[in-house]
Interface confidence: low
Amino acid sequence: RDKVMSEFNNNFRQQMENYPKNNHTASILDRMQADFKCCGAANYTDWEKIPSMSKNRVPDSCCINVTVGCGINFNEKAIHKEGCVEKIGGWLRKNVLEQKLISEEDLGGEQKLISEEDLHHHHHH
């Protein structure tokens, strides 16, 4: 499990770096953050470390009430502060690993998913 979570953490951070450059990666991370009410890998401050993301900005999908541009010059009280790796990882543990529905090899597909899909260039609106 620790290995799975470590890989998921590394992959999530890697995809964060791709967020400003790849629209399809952005769309998947946006949906994850919106669905799981989380922001960043460990927490929302992780977005500060992304070179091509401007300071004082997180994706709009981090906002508690998502509106266009809500992540720019955000107020801490208006965004989800909890990190996605722990939150999604906890969900995976509860719903997947503990039910023994999938193996660690299957979870490896989650790492593969976005990186394989990134080979295709998708635009979004």
Epitope: S27, I28, K112
Partner: antibody, heavy 119, light 108 residues
Framework: QVQLVESGGGLVKPGGSLRLSCAVS????????MNWIRQAPGKGLEWVSY????????YYADSVKGRFTISRDNAKNSLYLQMNGLRADDTAVYYC????????????WGQGTLVTVSS | DIQMTQSPSSLSASVGDRVTITCRAS??????LNWYQQKPGKAPRLLIY???NLQSGVPSRFSGGGSGTDFTLTISSLQPADFATYYC??????????FGQGTRLEIN
């Protein structure tokens, strides 16, 4: 009970436009992402577009990008699909669909509205 | 995009039979797989979510299984109301979600 009722379908010529509407009731609309999913006659299901609960996040299938626009009016509990540049292969029943969370399936569907694109 | 392939495309069976429909994903989707039933002229109905969880109100004769790339929908004892078309759908890569081509279950 949860209800989703589509309207606005009909016959339109290729290149024409149509606006579909979906009136929802029976749940807190602002809690849910919403989708349009279509089904060509005698064919399978194809996801078209989704919109986040606030309306800020929107995504489209490649087949409709640049031609279709999804929107919602949370005050009116309504979902819309503006369809421009319609083509024959857009002919389908269009369903308005509630999306509780991306990993839990589409739990409520409208009855559908038929869009026919033909000259 | 992730491709979903169902088999068989159509299936004939009798009331009381045990029936299994399979769905294969082009890459691992963990357990993010849903099953729907659709009757002619009606909207699809969610049966199973998360590969194996029964949606509220769905009879217990329906069950789902599998993980990774291979999944099954099983009807333990077919009832007249079960003759319909069944679709699988992945929600792992979202957007876009993708559906299988459908399996038509007919009366033998």
């Amino acid at each position: 009970q949860v209800q989703l009722v589509e309207s606005g379908g009909g016959l339109v010529k290729p290149g024409g436009s149509l606006r579909l509407s979906c009136a929802v009731s029976g749940f807190t609309y602002t809690d849910y992402f919403m989708n349009w999913i279509r089904q060509a006659p005698g064919k399978g299901l194809e996801w078209v577009s989704y919109i986040s609960n606030s309306g800020a996040i929107k995504y489209y299938a490649d087949s409709v990008k640049g031609r279709f626009t999804i929107s919602r009016d949370n005050a009116k509990n309504s979902l819309y699909l503006q369809m421009n540049g319609l083509r024959a292969d857009d002919t389908a029943v269009y369903y308005c669909v509630r999306d509780p969370r991306s990993y839990y399936g589409f739990d409520y569907w409208g009855q559908g509205t038929l869009v026919t694109v033909s000259s | 995009d992730i491709q979903m392939t169902q088999s068989p495309s159509s299936l004939s069976a009798s009331v009381g039979d045990r029936v299994t429909i399979t769905c294969r994903a082009s890459q691992s989707i963990s357990n993010f797989l849903n099953w729907y039933q659709q009757k002619p002229g009606k909207a699809p109905r969610l049966l199973i979510y998360g590969a194996s969880n029964l949606q509220s109100g769905v009879p217990s004769r329906f069950s789902g299984g599998g993980s990774g790339t291979d999944f099954t929908l099983t009807i333990s004892s077919l009832q007249p109301a079960d003759f319909a078309t069944y679709y699988c759908q992945q929600s792992f890569s979202n957007p876009p979600v993708t559906f299988g081509q459908g399996t038509r279950l007919e009366i033998n």
